[in-house]
Interface confidence: medium
């Protein structure tokens, strides 16, 4: 297959909702009308898949029902928010795109964004 | 020189089962995207299926759709179509074919023949 | 899906001869379309990918031009063996799709 530059930023913090949101950014050298879009979590030297979509040129990228990601696209940025996470899902994230349709078929894999998140602290107990 | 072998076509009743086979060889199997298309007795040409170089993906033709399910082996250098409630229409020559990284379907193979029929 | 028209399906020409085959797509593909010959005992081959651009192998006689919505084929200096029928096909757009065929023969 054929290589293509995938952007992602370095850091990212997680909101104390557990949210975070990054673009990721490919160099896209054709007209590609269906891209995938897979994130990866990388800790320990374990890579796990976290979610993927499908999309058309100028759709929406639909995820499947239980995923905690959500995403929006435009042009050759797809943004992405996982949310749901805690502080043991601190890791790199790591953005691979595919042009899966028309050939020819190129794959992108970004460095990775840190994402950190931390647990928010219980509330102190109030006296009143 | 790659070679694309088919088998396992045959004279089946409608609403049965059956499932293809390809033998791939001559090229590094698992780096390439597969398809099946089919020839009607009419001579039509007609895309029915395709699965990604590492079997993570599949897509097949709305006519096939939830009856044909395309498969690969990458040990065995394998490309699967297994057919179930076949119906008269599905009557064909079925190609296996190999996708090009820069094209679609670059080499075909010699087809083999697929009859439904009571 | 894009249609795929091939208004002529059988021409027959003397060798030697130019041929063209045309085929018109219901969509701008962008010039992603292929060339295939079916030989007569089913042998399938690509002859043009991406409108005009010769697959390995394939005779220099052959050609392939066209965009937008309208594509062609040239065979120049007919042979024998180029009694076929040909395809062209569509990839611009999943699902990819065929023209109904032109069918080659020798007079």
């Known amino acids: 297959c054929k290589a293509m530059h995938v952007a992602q930023p370095a850091v990212v913090l997680a909101s104390s909702r557990g949210i975070a949101s990054f673009v990721c950014e490919y160099a896209s050298p054709g007209k590609a009308t269906e891209v995938r879009v897979t994130v990866l979590r990388q800790a320990d030297s374990q890579v796990t898949e976290v979610c993927a979509a499908t999309y058309m040129m100028g759709n929406e990228l639909t995820f499947l029902d239980d995923s905690i990601c959500t995403g929006t696209s435009s042009g050759n940025q797809v943004n992405l928010t996982i949310q749901g996470l805690r502080a043991m899902d601190t890791g790199l994230y790591i953005c691979k795109v595919e042009l899966m349709y028309p050939p020819p078929y190129y794959l992108g894999i970004g460095n990775g964004t840190q994402i950190y998140v931390i647990d928010p602290e219980p509330c102190p107990d109030s006296d009143f | 020189e790659v070679q694309l072998v088919e088998s396992g076509g045959g004279l089946v009743r409608p609403g049965r089962s059956l499932k293809l086979s390809c033998a791939a060889s001559g090229f590094t199997f698992s780096n390439y995207a597969m398809s099946w298309v089919r020839q009607s007795p009419e001579k039509r040409l007609e895309w029915v299926a395709e699965?990604?170089?590492?079997?993570?993906?599949?897509y097949h033709s709305d006519t096939v759709t939830g009856r044909f399910t395309i498969s690969r082996d990458n040990a065995k250098n394998t490309l699967y179509l297994e057919m179930s409630s076949l119906k008269s229409e599905d009557t064909a020559i079925y190609y296996c074919?190999?996708?090009?990284?820069?094209?679609?379907?670059?080499?075909w193979g010699q087809g083999t023949s697929v009859t439904v029929s009571s | 899906d894009i249609q795929m028209t091939q208004t002529t399906s059988s021409l027959s020409a003397s060798l030697g001869d130019r041929v063209t085959i045309t085929c018109r797509t219901s969509q701008v593909i962008t010039n992603y379309l292929n060339w295939y010959q079916v030989k007569p005992d089913g042998t399938v081959k690509l002859l043009i990918y991406?409108?005009?651009r010769l697959h390995s192998g394939v005779p220099s006689r052959f050609s392939g031009s066209g965009s937008g919505t309208d594509y062609s084929l040239t065979i120049s200096n007919l042979e024998p063996e180029d009694v076929a029928t040909y395809y062209c096909q569509q990839f611009g757009k999943r699902p990819p799709t065929f023209g109904g065929g032109t069918k080659l023969e020798i007079k």
């Open positions: 991406y409108t005009s």
């Open positions: 699965i990604s170089y590492s079997g993570t993906y599949s």
């Open positions: 074919t190999r996708r090009d990284y820069d094209n679609e379907m670059d080499y």
